[in-house]
Structures are given as structure tokens and as C-alpha cells.
Amino acid sequence: EVEKTACPSGKKAREIDESLIFYKKWELEACVDAALLATQMDRVNAIPFTYEQLDVLKHKLDELYPQGYPESVIQHLGYLFLKMSPEDIRKWNVTSLETLKALLEVNKGHEMSPQVATLIDRFVKGRGQLDKDTLDTLTAFYPGYLCSLSPEELSSVPPSSIWAVRPQDLDTCDPRQLDVLYPKARLAFQNMNGSEYFVKIQSFLGGAPTEDLKALSQQNVSMDLATFMKLRTDAVLPLTVAEVQKLLGPHVEGLKAEERHRPVRDWILRQRQDDLDTLGLGLQGGIPNGYLVLDLSMQEALS
């Protein structure tokens, strides 16, 4: 806390300008009126205040707005945002996307801080859902944002927002998250033609069920191995050799290099060796000829 001291004669600030950078902390406290600061917040970012001076300015705003800052002030916080705690931010009601963008810009290039996470949480909760414009903004600043959400949180993403998602935004998503996002993407892109649809849906396929993979295998999509390796193992296992061959097209040769890795390894174990041999890739580990394959999971389901 800065002690309350009288402002020296002639030092009372009439406006927020560069002359204030020469004020000591106690002078800023004594000579800058909080209401003046609030109305001229847009000037603060244009003045090279030190961290210590920003502390004083924050203190003044806190005294003026003990219940939380109005959005007109929040939008112009600039570097002062770095001084805010999550507790401060929880008092705010941020509704404008422009305000959100302005504050994210301050933290640009740095890891998502607890302050930023709190800000985003407040903003999204205030909007009720993660709409396209918000998602666009968040993934522009934090490409991994989508994958930081829980499956429950992702369930509030409307299918229309999926258009804003870029492949790199899904890089760190796990299967549980893709399970939620895939049906939304399927819905969002449903009116696209075959090849365009595949380009858009490709990054979401880690959440695709077997029947959708079977359908894709009929469309000459030529899925690359990187995408195939990210598919759900349980979705890949029921695919026949012919279906995988059609799904991968010319990329089928890549199976050999991946034969020891999931899901390829587990898929090989489920195929007849005869069928694998038709690929001419030298894949080994299939079911030998003459063996009967019992699908016990089907038997359990029937009983």
C-alpha cells in the first residue's frame, strides 16, 4: 500500500500524459485522480509506465471500482491486464469480442496464464456457448485452446463453430475430445461434396466410428498414413483388408513401416493372413489359414 500523502503544488495531473512517467509512486498515488484515469484509460498503453507505476494505477482503479471494472475501462487496460489477478477478473463482466481481443493481444506470444484462462472462461460463460467468432479469436491466439477444453465443455460448441477450426488446432486433442468434436464436424460439413468433405473432416477423424470409415473407403479419398495412425483402434479393427486398401489408396504401402504400431498392429492381428498377403507388402501376424475366428464380443451381446 502507498501512504496517503498530499500532492505537491503544481503536480496535480490534468490529463494522463507522458509527463507522469517521471512521477514517483507516491506522487502518482497523490496526484492522479482515479476518475480521470478511468476516462483516459486509452492513453495508458501509449505511455511507457514501469511495472511499479502500473501497480499504482491498478490500485487507483481498484479503489474506484471495488466491485469490478466496467467494460469501458477493461477494454483499454492494455499492459495493466498483466497486473490483474484471476480474482480481479472474476469480478468482470466482459461481453464484447473486441475487449477480449484487446486483452489477448497483451498476452500474445506467451503461454496462457491463469489470468487469460479466467478471462476466457468468464467470456464464454457470459455468451452461453463457444460461438464461431469467439472460437476464431481464441484459436488465433492459442492454437491449442480447443484441446484444453474438457469433453463436457466441448459439448457446448455449436456445429457452426467447427468451420473456424484449423487442423493445427486439433494437434493436441485426445480421443475423448475428438469423440465429441467429430459428430459436430460431420454435421457442419455434411453438405460438401466428397473430396472437399474429406479435406475438412480429415483432422477430426480420430473420433470417427467404423461405419463412417467404411463409407469413406468407398469414396477414393486416399487417406495418408498420419491420419490413419490417429484413428480409433476400435474403429479400425473391424475394417477388412479390402476396405483399408481402398481407404488408403496409394498410401497403403505405408502400412509396412507401421506394422508394429497401433492401430496397424492390432488390425493385422484381426485379419486373415491370406487377405494380408493380397496387399503384397509382406505384412505378418495375421490369422493363419484354416483357423476359425469367433467374435466373442458379438456372442456376449446376444446372450
Epitope: F49, T50, Y51, L82, K108, G109, H110
Partner: nanobody
Framework: EVQLVESGGGLVQAGGALRLSCAAS????????MGWFRQAPGKEREFVAA????????YYADSVKGRFTISKDNAKNTVYLQMSSLKPEDTAVYYC???????????????WGQGTQVTVSS
Amino acid sequence: EVQLVESGGGLVQAGGALRLSCAASERTFSSSSMGWFRQAPGKEREFVAAINRIGGHIYYADSVKGRFTISKDNAKNTVYLQMSSLKPEDTAVYYCASSRIYSHSARDYDYWGQGTQVTVSS
């Protein structure tokens, strides 16, 4: 790792000009305000100029105002200090530094270059 590399220093006659450059990594450059400081022998490090990442605002120390110009090239991730009408008292090691905020205080700058010597002879 953050790296700031200055260049362009040298020996120049009073009244002459020099242009200092400071190359930064793309990440540092896009997420930081950049400043120039100088330190003469036996003296404290002194603020020279800064350029604000947000809004591009610029601030100069009174001692260099009207003579020095700070600028940046986003495509090259480089900040410059164009120095003209140089005086013997401008002799110092010039440092480039980056900060998360737009500040005139050396304490607020996290990363520093190795410095480049500027000598102005009379």
C-alpha cells in the same frame, strides 16, 4: 531461447550518423516491446528509446529527442536506432532489450543483447 543481437556500432566523428540494428527471434519480436539503452563508462545504464508492440507508440529520452529515431521491420524481426547529429557525450555501449510491457525502466526489460560500442570523437 531468446536472442537479441546488436550490430552497427563503431567510431564516428561528432555530427556524424550511425544506424544500430537489433535482430530478435520471431517469437520475442512479436510478443515484446523493444527498447534501446546505453551505458557510458562509470555511469548507470540509461534509457534511450522504446517502441511499443501494441499500437507502435514511440518514446525518446529528452537527451536524444530530435536526433535519434527508433523503428522496426516486422518482416525482418529487427529494431533499428538511427542516430544522427552525434555528440561526444553519446559515446557508450548501446544495448537492445525486450520487455512484455512498454516501459522506460531497464528493470522491466527481461532480455538483453550483448551490446555494441559507439564512440563519437570530437
